[in-house]
């Protein structure tokens, strides 16, 4: 798209549950009529234009995808669609993958669940909700990164080596806050700067580790936008 | 190549009734949304109508609601807007229009229109 | 119901000038407008969808863009047959409303 023509960004984890957002303002007068919606989900990916599914034809439609900055954008296809009684439609491959809470339906939660999400599912999505007497849409862009931590030297350590430990996420923007933490058996243990901890932004430093400092070790990323992502690490110290 | 033509248009006393026509080629109709859309002389467009490729939905502008229906009719790639109670001001060209999606409300194909002069 | 504002109401140009059109949008549309080219006696045609997508066969002289409640419409150098009126609706959420239109005269 143009710069100055976008949708809200969604920012996901590959591999981790994703939560596509859809609660249009829905007129007080329609909520009782919520279980009659009915509700599609179209996705139009980044790149490389998705197998039609044998017996599921890509929805129909001029499919002209000529945007005014780039060429041809992969055509789009039907994640999803709940018909008013419920009945369900969709892509096979994704079928498995794909969840709408029919709770969340009945509240006005038209929200899309990916579980888990995969590279391939970045793109535009929107939402058509059909109430009894009115259309309403969603639209966002979906942008799925990879977390990984790092440690500098990699490998098992020796008491008294140094580590650095990287927590990173594939996103431009960098987090608002970083928090670290050990995993032990009662549960998570916050790291807190000490002589033996040094934290700075996205780093851990341990100037000399010891056979204590084996095991679990665990960051979380969170962002302006709310998203966060947990990290772990296992860190080996040899006796 | 992709047509709408329209039909039916015509004179009309006030609280009279008139059934336009759209007869639908060159794509497969039965899977497109269909809308009704209309221009007074010297207006801007006014979306009147809508109805979805599986007539699950209808939809109404509430200057219509009540007094206008739209049909289809897919074995004859047919879609109907049937006026009752016609006043004054639904004088207008009323255009047949294809929806880009059902879930992707702008009109990408029209008719050459119809015209509804509603007067005594 | 979402109202689209459109201006100018009017614009006088010679061909080959850049021209831009704006529609504000009552309330947020996301990227949800499509913008219209209808000549007098004629149908409306669509030119942009989605905000700035180009429909089939537009020339690339015409361009869409904006989000939210503002947007966009432009003609990067005014042709002989661009001389119409042009109108942008929003396809957000019924019922779908459409500016009151520019009329690109020549000047």
């Known amino acids: 798209l143009q710069p100055g023509a976008e949708v809200p960004v969604v920012w996901a984890q590959e591999g981790a549950p994703a939560q596509l957002p859809c609660s249009p303002t829905i007129p007080l007068q329609d909520l009782s009529l919520l279980r009659r919606a009915g509700v599609t989900w179209q996705h139009q990916p980044d790149s490389g234009p998705p197998a039609a599914a044998p017996g599921h034809p890509l929805a129909p439609g001029p499919h002209p995808a000529a945007p005014s900055s780039w060429g041809p954008r992969p055509r789009r296809y039907t994640v999803l669609s709940v018909g008013p009684g419920g009945l369900r439609s969709g892509r096979l491959p994704l079928q498995p993958r794909v969840q709408l809470d029919e709770r969340g339906r009945q509240r006005g939660d038209f929200s899309l669940w990916l579980r888990p999400a995969r590279r391939a599912d970045a793109g535009e999505y929107r939402a058509a909700v059909h109430l009894r007497d009115r259309a309403l849409s969603c639209r966002l862009r979906l942008r799925l990164g990879q977390a990984s931590m790092t440690a500098s030297p990699p490998g098992s350590l020796r008491a008294s080596d140094w580590v650095i430990l990287n927590c990173s996420f594939s996103r431009p923007d960098r987090p608002a806050s970083v928090h670290w933490f050990r995993n032990r058996g009662q549960g998570r243990v916050p790291v807190r700067e000490s002589p033996h901890h040094h934290l700075a932004e996205s780093f851990l430093f341990l100037p000399q580790v010891s056979p204590m400092d084996s095991g679990p070790w665990g960051c979380i990323l969170t962002y302006r936008d709310g998203f966060n992502v947990s990290i772990m690490y296992n860190l080996t110290v040899l006796g | 190549q992709v047509q709408l033509v329209e039909s039916g248009g015509g004179l009309v006393k006030p609280g009279g009734s008139l059934r336009l026509s759209c007869a639908a080629s060159?794509?497969?109709?039965?899977?497109?949304?269909m809308s009704w859309v209309r221009q007074a002389p010297g207006k801007r467009l006014e979306w009147v109508a809508y109805?979805?490729?599986?007539?699950?939905?209808?939809y109404y502008a509430d200057t219509v609601k009540g007094r206008f229906t739209i049909s289809r009719d897919d074995a004859k790639n047919s879609l109907y807007l049937q006026m009752n109670s016609l006043r004054a001001e639904d004088t207008a060209m009323y255009y047949c229009?294809?929806?880009?999606?059902?879930?992707?409300?702008?009109?990408?194909?029209w008719g050459q229109g119809a015209l509804v002069t509603v007067s005594s | 119901d979402i109202q689209m504002t459109q201006s100018p109401s009017s614009v006088s140009t010679s061909v080959g000038d850049r021209v831009t059109i704006t529609c504000k949008a009552s309330?947020?549309?996301?990227?949800?407008v499509a913008w219209y080219q209808q000549k007098p006696g004629k149908a409306p045609k669509l030119l942009i969808y989605s905000a700035s997508y180009r429909y089939t066969g537009v020339p690339s002289r015409f361009s869409g863009s904006g989000s939210g409640t503002d947007f966009t419409f432009t003609i990067s150098s005014v042709q002989p047959e661009d001389f119409a009126t042009y109108y942008c609706q929003q396809h957000d959420s019924s019922p779908w409303t459409f500016g009151q239109g520019t009329k690109l005269e020549i000047k």
């Open positions: 229009t294809r929806v880009a999606y059902d879930y992707e409300w702008y009109f990408d194909v």
């Open positions: 309330q947020d549309v996301t990227t949800a």
């Open positions: 109805v979805t490729s599986g007539g699950d939905y209808i």
């Open positions: 060159g794509f497969t109709f039965s899977s497109y949304a």
